[in-house]
Every structure is written in structure tokens, then in C-alpha cells.
């Protein structure tokens, strides 16, 4: 999906109202200096693109975000102000057959989400150079 | 599996108001996502508003200030209050749910037509 033509301003107020406090409250107890960045994104799609990656596709150590309350916020986010994300979410989920799998926080998830957190940041500031 | 039904559509003048009900039952989850979606003819299906189980809420610029959503979790019903409505807003209304066991919406209603017209 290109995240192009997102209202990216009405994505940063959602975020800023509510993912934000969702994904401080799943890193509760972790340290903000515990785990690098090493993701980054150069401009708010890209970002989007990063964002979406590492929150609904399961990787290894961490297979379930995307059943967090922060994940579903981002997705009905991106349907609402992404034009045809939601048709493209809808056909995916046709096309594929469901898989379920148990909420478990690793470690690994919690690195996942340290990085969602600085995706966010930078997501949030877009005029700041790419360090 | 969870089952829901819509109910409260139907036709309605211009500045008009509507309430649409989404009643789910089966095996339902605390932590979820409700949605109401629309589909005009010829146009792609739209998430207009969602409510989360902490009691957050979005909404299209479309209908934000005349549309309100809102949840019953003890009737484990959503509804969408639909106010000042416009022509523009006429199209078949879905509810949709996902909840902390489930995909993208995997679940559905059979929708509910809505016409705004004089």
C-alpha cells in the first residue's frame, strides 16, 4: 500500500491522543534507555510503511502485535484516513486464511515496540533531518 | 464465532437523524474494536467511525461533529447516533468487529440501507 495520500496530520492526532498511550502503557516497567533504535524512516511514508511492517507482520520472537490495542488503533487509523487501505485490509484478509495466535510479551516484542515508539517520533516530526 | 446484526436503517429526510444498533453475540473478547463502515453505490466501503474497549473513539472528517459512536458493553451492542444528515451520507451501513483473538474486521454484519432524500 503507498501511504502517499494519508491525512497524516489526522493520523499524528490519533496518535498523539491515544496510540501513544497505549504503546507507553504495554512498555511499562521497560527502561526508555534499555533497547537502540535501529529502525528508521526517512519521511512520513515511509515511516507509515515502517509503522505498519513492524506492527501487523509477525516476525521471529514476536508473533502477536497486531492483537495489541495499539495495533488495532493504527489500523482503524490508517482505514479511516489512508484512501483504500481498508479495501486493500479487506482483500488480504479474504485472501489469506485466519491465523490465531496467543497475546505473549517477549522481550522481543518489547523491543519491537521501542522501535514502533521512535517510528512514531520521527513519524510526528517530519521537518527534522535524518540523522 | 461472533454473529452481529444491524438494525435502524431506513429512510430519512435531509438534516434528519437516524440511530443504527450493532448487536453481537457469540464469543466476544474485552479488548476489541467495533466499526461502522458504508458503501455508497460505486464507490469502495469506508470506515467511518470506531470505538475501542477503553472507550476512545475515531472518526471520518465525513461525518466528525454529526455522527456519534458509542457501545453498550453490558447489551454487547454498538451504536452509531447519525444527525444533521445529508444525501451524500445514503449508502448501505456495516458493523464490523475485531477483537484481540481475530484479523482485520473479521467479522460482519448483513448491513443496513440508509437513504437520505426528500
Known amino acids: 500500500y503507498d501511504f502517499t495520500n494519508c491525512d497524516f496530520e489526522k493520523i499524528k492526532a490519533a496518535y498523539l491522543s491515544t496510540i501513544s498511550k497505549d504503546l507507553i502503557t504495554y512498555m511499562s516497567g521497560t527502561k526508555s534507555t534499555e533497547f537502540n533504535n535501529t529502525v528508521s524512516c526517512s519521511n512520513r511514508p515511509h515511516c507509515l510503511t515502517e509503522i505498519q511492517s513492524l506492527t501487523f507482520n509477525p516476525t521471529a520472537g514476536c508473533a502477536s502485535l497486531a492483537k495489541e490495542m495499539f495495533a488495532m488503533k493504527t489500523k482503524a487509523a490508517l482505514a479511516i484516513w489512508c484512501p483504500g487501505y481498508s479495501e486493500t485490509q479487506i482483500n488480504a484478509t479474504q485472501a489469506m486464511k485466519k491465523r490465531r495466535k496467543r497475546k505473549v510479551t517477549t522481550n522481543k516484542c518489547l523491543e519491537q515496540v521501542s522501535q514502533l515508539q521512535g517510528l512514531w517520533r520521527r513519524f510526528n516530526r517530519p521537518l527534522l533531518k535524518q540523522q | 464465532e461472533v454473529q452481529l446484526v444491524e438494525s435502524g436503517g431506513g429512510l430519512v429526510q435531509p438534516g434528519g437523524s437516524l440511530r443504527l444498533s450493532c448487536a453481537a453475540s457469540?464469543?466476544?473478547?474485552?479488548?476489541?474494536?467495533m466499526g461502522w463502515f458504508r458503501q455508497a453505490p460505486g464507490k469502495e466501503r469506508e470506515l467511518v467511525s470506531a470505538?475501542?474497549?477503553?472507550?476512545?473513539?475515531l472518526y471520518a472528517d465525513s461525518v466528525k461533529g454529526r455522527f456519534t459512536i458509542s457501545a453498550d458493553n453490558s447489551k454487547n451492542t454498538a451504536y452509531l447516533q447519525m444527525n444533521s444528515l445529508k444525501p451524500e451520507d445514503t449508502a448501505v451501513y456495516y458493523c464490523?468487529?475485531?477483537?484481540?483473538?481475530?484479523?482485520?474486521?473479521?467479522?460482519w454484519g448483513q448491513g443496513t440501507l440508509v437513504t437520505v432524500s426528500s
Open positions: 464490523a468487529r475485531e477483537d484481540s483473538s481475530s484479523g482485520w474486521f473479521d467479522y
Open positions: 457469540g464469543r466476544t473478547f474485552r479488548s476489541y474494536v
Open positions: 470505538i475501542f474497549s477503553d472507550g476512545s473513539t
